[in-house]
Amino acid sequence: QLTTESMPFNVAEGKEVLLLVHNLPQQLFGYSWYKGERVDGNRQIVGYAIGTQQATPGPANSGRETIYPNASLLIQNVTQNDTGFYTLQVIKSDLVNEEATGQFHVYPELPKPSISSNNSNPVEDKDAVAFTCEPETQDTTYLWWINNQSLPVSPRLQLSNGNRTLTLLSVTRNDTGPYECEIQNPVSANRSDPVTLNVTYGPDTPTISPSDTYYRPGANLSLSCYAASNPPAQYSWLINGTFQQSTQELFIPNITVNNSGSYTCHANNSVTGCNRTTVKTIIVTELSPVVAKPQIKASKTTVTGDKDSVNLTCSTNDTGISIRWFFKNQSLPSSERMKLSQGNTTLSINPVKREDAGTYWCEVFNPISKNQSDPIMLNVNYNALPQENGLSPG
């Protein structure tokens, strides 16, 4: 059975294709190739006579065809018009003709695509954006990439127009991209340059830093306000409701107690038209805004019950503070045997009982701050008494 095979079947425009012939009969007068699915003298590409070992170009010969003695046909510099069927007619010595038809498909070498957008500055949670991959070409597959990843499954992402258009419904600030489109056909692939979205959003609720509330008189008050926003927010400050200045940072040197009050940061995005405010209370006081961690010491940590006493001391360098004691999360003193002295810096237990064993800690505090010591463990031992009858008491 005479057959033909296209090598390759899918050909890039400008390249070459070889129509290979299989099972060519032995005793031949010659053969001819025709464009199309049937023998048509007007569409003859080439004829070859065995007797002259010479080929003759036909009316459909473009000068790009080369026939080989084995009847194979090479077509060079193919165009998309060359796509289609080709028929080989073999004239045998017995004057019986045999025919075989093959085909190939010519695809263009794809250009570098580009992305067009209907809105390059969308507003968050409000606008949709449609990206279109250009150019539109036949027999082409369109693919999209976001952040170098294939498209995630999302109800906000829609493909249309044969995947040539990617629509983002209700964009968010995380949709900036980059976005790339890729076009593919059986012979080539090409990817666009990346495109990023400038998503307009915000401002979010501003944050005032630092987070400190308490300041000493004479200190410098330096507050900074930040709200996530695109374009960047415009800031203004109010103190106790009175406008101060339109800056991101507020600086007041050498503050006094009179500078205590509510500090408001106002953030505005002129594009979205949205405003957000945050209020922070500032207290200027002599009191230490941060109380240092106190140290706890014991006259001894292992004592004999009903016999020994123990003194626990809470040490701090801070002034204007108060001290309180805790034992097993309970406030002390909790019995007649416990006494506080020296402004509560010392806790005395006399005598120590079995139930006094456990964890003790102290806490120093002022009206605006407090801090706890590390815990200390008190162990209470009893001298072993001989058992008289092996029965437990009571």
Epitope: Y48, I50, G51, T52, Q53, Q54, A55, T56, P57, G58, P59, N61, G63, T66, I67, Y68, P69, N70
Partner: antibody, heavy 118, light 113 residues
Framework: QVQLVQSGSELKKPGASVKVSCKAS????????MNWVRQAPGQGLQWMGW????????TYAQGFTGRFVFSLDTSVSTAYLQISSLKTEDTAVYYC???????????WGQGTLVTVSS | DIVMTQSPDSLAVSLGERATINCKPS????????????LAWYQQKPGQPPKLLIH???TRESGVPDRFSGSGSGTDFTLTISSLQAEDVAVYYC?????????FGQGTKLEIK
């Protein structure tokens, strides 16, 4: 690459015979016809004829019948030109040239000088 | 039989100048069904075999410098060397392969003036 290599120069006496060989490489000998061309000293090119390398059938141009024989040995990819009863006017360079599939001649052998002198 | 007539028999041209050689077949070598002229041009340098330059009357063989060009149709053909180089000194032959016997022109010897 496609190449035709011919045998070396020959000096013959009138009446003798000569056999010029043309070895083909870089392709299958039987796929393309082989032409023979004569160039007498200081003269132009004269087509002597060709041999169908597929069938072995020779075709001789006018004036090259009788004493001239084209033959093949496909086992060694070689075509031959044999001239018998040599005459002094047979002194020439003899070229083999592959018949391209469309009919022109390409490539050519380097030529074999046959000198017939008493 | 088709007789090929070349003119001139010899030609002297200055380096860098244009050289033109004509060839006239005694009958048309244009095959009407495919509109192809069955004519080739060859270059033969001294001591060398001929080398194919042009086929189908105007199609330059690969590797042939583009200063060589062929033109014409039917019974009137021209080989042109647009800017003669020293290495172009040779004898040039036209040949028809339209019919058997194929035939060559008598040759044109090209020299430098």
């Amino acid at each position: 690459q496609v190449q035709l290599v011919q045998s070396g120069s020959e000096l013959k006496k009138p009446g003798a015979s000569v056999k010029v060989s043309c070895k083909a490489s870089g392709y299958t000998l039987t796929d393309y016809g082989m032409n023979w061309v004569r160039q007498a000293p200081g003269q132009g090119l004269q087509w002597m004829g060709w041999i169908n390398t597929n069938t072995g059938n020779p075709t001789y141009a006018q004036g090259f019948t009788g004493r001239f024989v084209f033959s093949l040995d496909t086992s060694v990819s070689t075509a031959y030109l044999q001239i018998s009863s040599l005459k002094t006017e047979d002194t020439a360079v003899y070229y083999c040239a592959r018949k391209a599939i469309w009919g022109w001649f390409d490539p050519w052998g380097q030529g074999t000088l046959v000198t017939v002198s008493s | 039989d088709i007789v090929m007539t070349q003119s001139p028999d010899s030609l002297a041209v200055s380096l860098g100048e244009r050289a033109t050689i004509n060839c006239k077949p005694s009958q048309s070598v244009l095959y009407r069904s495919n509109n192809k002229n069955y004519l080739a041009w060859y270059q033969q340098k001294p001591g060398q075999p001929p080398k194919l330059l042009i086929h189908w009357a105007s199609t330059r063989e690969s590797g042939v410098p583009d200063r060589f060009s062929g033109s014409g149709s039917g019974t009137d053909f021209t080989l042109t060397i647009s800017s003669l180089q020293a290495e172009d000194v040779a004898v040039y032959y036209c040949q028809q392969y339209y019919s058997t016997p194929c035939s060559f022109g008598q040759g044109t010897k090209l020299e430098i003036k």
